[in-house]
Amino acid sequence: SGVFQLQLQEFINERGVLASGRPCEPGCRTFFRVCLKHFQAVVSPGPCTFGTVSTPVLGTNSFAVRDDSSGGGRNPLQLPFNFTWPGTFSLIIEAWHAPGDDLRPEALPPDALISKIAIQGSLAVGQNWLLDEQTSTLTRLRYSYRVICSDNYYGDNCSRLCKKRNDHFGHYVCQPDGNLSCLPGWTGEYCQQPICLSGCHEQNGYCSKPAECLCRPGWQGRLCNECIPHNGCRHGTCSTPWQCTCDEGWGGLFCDQDLNYCTHHSPCKNGATCSNSGQRSYTCTCRPGYTGVDCELELSECDSNPCRNGGSCKDQEDGYHCLCPPGYYGLHCEHSTLSCADSPCFNGGSCRERNQGANYACECPPNFTGSNCEKKVDRCTSNPCANGGQCLNRGPSRMCRCRPGFTGTYCELHVSDCARNPCAHGGTCHDLENGLMCTCPAGFSGRRCEVRTSIDACASSPCFNRATCYTDLSTDTFVCNCPYGFVGSRCEFPVGLPPSFPW
């Protein structure tokens, strides 16, 4: 759709005569009829297929025609068309004399024609005004013409409809060729798609208006590139939503079970070495001079009874000192000045000469020890109890009090926690160094498989259109992460363009 515009500029009829050569009385009151039609190889009479227009009387004999376009007048003349502009045309302009006020063709005598021109033209849309002049023996007509597109029509032949808009159906203005030019922040064929915040994750984020970044279920952060871990996840992370991948040293469904008590709590004191031995379980290896489960107790250096032959031990800042009984000397009273003749063996010990009587050795009865059988045997001195068991002296014998999970005379036997079938609902039991672990069948959880949970909600593949399914273990439900172009709780609805565009 467009308009052929014809600007009449000047008409010269100096002698004021008609085409027949007869003069006008009193002068030629001139008006024009214009016929626009399809291009003809030979211009020939026939219908004005592109339209006609007439002017009022514009002047007498010779005159210039005023440009009336600004005042809403009729110059340039407008010949609208509502088809694709073909680029070529035939144009006929007739100048007529109006003896009276009635300018209708049937009201004029046939010899009222002053002059007539007929041309074949070629004209592109939007071209500048094309100036032409037609001269005959008696008259001259100067005129120009051009073709412009109607509002909202564009392109080389005014065939492209484009109406700027900024609403649900599009956000664009129109280029000279009729192509859409999206407003800032919009993209797509009809500029309906907002351009999300720069960096917004393509799959995990979306937007309904420009520079926005809304996260799909299971994602968070300014750019929706951080997954949301499982509800209740304590010491874990995720790479896809609702995961709980435990940090080093943590275990369990929610990563809340401490597998590295040593690092997290540093229970061993006084420079002792800590070894993890199971969930919340550890063993401290004490440095010399310390004892206790956590090596928290400082040992007196005399506790190890270093003085022999009945010597008494005295603690000192830098160690200890042995006070020897008569007949003995040395750091630990280990050297004797006695012989068997001095009856040095106590508690029924028998004396044996050594080194030709220069020395002796006592053979002690049971429950007594020492170079002179002077000490009652402390059967706990050698730490015979394994696995952290506590040694107790019981008269002539000793006894080990074992830590939980261990048994045997010396706590050397590991009690099988699985023996009493502690795992419920068919859970599989695994003995650990200090305790047990249950591997639960689907649908059960908890330390002993005692908690009934839902079967994986994603197992039934409830999501459509290649959406990703995530199980939300906190609510026993699934969440579908839709690919671009689909919506709905199961991604079952395609997002279609509107069926028509109201412009």
């Epitope: 003809q40 190889a41 030979v42 211009v43 020939s44 009479p45 026939g46 070529t88 035939s90 006929i92 007539k116 021109i117 007929a118 041309i119 074949q120 033209g121 070629s122 032409d132 037609q134 001269t135 005959s136 023996t137």
Partner: antibody, heavy 118, light 107 residues
Framework: EVQLVESGGGLVQPGGSLRLSCAAS????????MYWIRQAPGKGLEWVAF????????YYRDSVKGRFTISRDNSKSTLYLQMNSLRAEDTAVYHC???????????WGQGTMVTVSS | DIQMTQSPSSLSASVGDRVTITCRAS??????LAWYQKKPGKSPKLLIY???RLQDGVPSRFSGSGSGTDYTLTISSLQPEDFATYFC?????????FGQGTKLEIK
């Protein structure tokens, strides 16, 4: 008196060139589209080329496209036909004509003979 | 291209006869058709244009009719000077195309 007088015809070898002219008088040459029309010996009339009144539009028959060029000089009221790469089948009497039936205009020249032969 | 089929190709008639020549176009030419008379050594002479309009100075015994694709030239009463070749020309689209001609001879 309206007159269209063609000139420039003659004998030319195949592949050769000729330039025909058509001098107009007795009417306003610049107002009308002009045509070249030919008639081969013993044959019917055949349109060759067209040029609009201002020279902005030209058309040619397929068999001469790229070989013939129509042009005009309105200041001299003269029409031209430059013929290159001539062939034996171009042999004919060439007429220039001013045709505008809307205005009742139909002027023909007497023609000039072009013979293409080796 | 628009083909113009003219008939008959030749015709014998006597002075005073009524003669009809036809031209058929291969597509609609919207009445953009002219009839010419051609005598040997002379330029063609326009008789009828726009299918039915008589050119100034042409005797009224010549008339034209038709529309769409079928057109007719009628000479109501042949005169001795009318013996010549007649042809049609379509001016609707390029290339311009002529009928093959009808040679009108004295019987």
């Amino acid at each position: 008196e309206v007159q269209l007088v063609e000139s420039g015809g003659g004998l030319v070898q195949p592949g050769g060139s000729l330039r025909l002219s058509c001098a107009a008088s007795g009417f306003t040459f610049s107002n009308y589209g002009m045509y070249w029309i030919r008639q081969a010996p013993g044959k019917g009339l055949e349109w060759v080329a067209f040029i609009s009144h201002g020279g902005g539009i030209t058309y040619y028959r397929d068999s001469v496209k790229g070989r013939f060029t129509i042009s005009r000089d309105n200041s001299k009221s003269t029409l031209y036909l430059q013929m290159n790469s001539l062939r034996a089948e171009d042999t004919a009497v060439y007429h220039c004509a001013a045709l505008n039936w809307e205005l009742g205009i139909d002027y023909w020249g007497q023609g000039t003979m072009v013979t293409v032969s080796s | 291209d628009i083909q113009m089929t003219q008939s008959p190709s030749s015709l014998s008639a006597s002075v005073g006869d009524r003669v009809t020549i036809t031209c058929r176009a291969s597509e609609d030419i919207y009445s953009n058709l002219a009839w010419y008379q051609k005598k040997p050594g002379k330029s063609p002479k326009l008789l009828i244009y726009a299918a039915n309009r008589l050119q100034d100075g042409v005797p009224s015994r010549f008339s034209g009719s038709g529309s769409g694709t079928d057109y007719t030239l009628t000479i109501s009463s042949l005169q001795p000077e009318d013996f010549a070749t007649y042809f049609c020309l379509q001016g609707s689209k390029f290339p311009l195309t002529f009928g093959q001609g009808t040679k009108l001879e004295i019987k």
